[in-house]
């Protein structure tokens, strides 16, 4: 039985050209995390594997950095980075847990005057 829950940063916004940290946290389970996949829609961004450590997909190497922790840092943001991001926790014996984050990348002037989703 899957008892765990994933907490995420939820809906967030960032400024074009800036960077953002995507974070998920799995709680309420004693299952062993064997792998965390970070995906944007259907594209694999990165994998953090318990045995092998981090691997960033080649097409994102210049703009994606591992961490902190099991999170992911996106750099040099563009408006095209707006969209859904998923953290997929592979665990044993529970199975797979998925968290969703929506990122909105705003033009600099818009971000300065208050975004819809603010990080406290």
């Amino acid at each position: 039985m899957m008892t765990g829950t994933i907490e995420t940063t939820g809906n967030i916004s960032a400024e074009k050209g800036g960077s953002i940290i995507l974070q998920c946290h799995l709680s309420s389970t004693t299952a062993q995390v064997t792998q965390v996949n970070w995906e944007q829609q259907d594209q694999l961004l990165a994998i953090c594997n318990a045995d092998l450590g981090w691997h960033i997909s080649p097409s994102f190497k210049d703009r994606v950095a591992p961490g902190p922790g099991l999170g992911l840092t996106l750099q040099s943001l563009t408006v095209n980075d707006t969209g859904e991001y998923f953290c997929i926790y592979h665990t044993y014996p529970d199975g797979t847990y998925t968290g969703r984050i929506f990122l909105e990348v705003l033009e600099s002037s818009v971000a300065e005057h208050g975004a819809r989703f603010q990080i406290p």
Epitope: T34, L44, I47, N49, H90
Partner: nanobody, 119 residues
Framework: EVQLVESGGGLVQAGGSLRLSCAAS????????MGWFRQAPGKEREFVAG????????VYADSVKGRFTISADNAKNTVYLQMNSLKPEDTAVYYC????????????WGQGTQVTVSS
Amino acid sequence: EVQLVESGGGLVQAGGSLRLSCAASGVTLDLYAMGWFRQAPGKEREFVAGIWRSGGSTVYADSVKGRFTISADNAKNTVYLQMNSLKPEDTAVYYCATWTTTWGRNRDWGQGTQVTVSS
């Protein structure tokens, strides 16, 4: 389901060398890494080395760094482990491992290949 067949084990004296091979069949497109684990009598299975198919970067357990070298032939879905300067504590059954984006590490193991290092 991926099938793993290991070979190349044997009996060798301390300081000697062996080269292990693992051929994987039934490989899926989401296979992203291959590697090796080992299990000594009475001990838990432990990670030895891994290699990412994209870019070929490698990861080693501290206990084998500088002595073991992992390599792969992606076209053949085969991974190799060159083991030099072997020590008696390297004695174990060596198992091939695969990692996929869908499942993480394989749940099913091959039969393994026995490596025995005598002093």
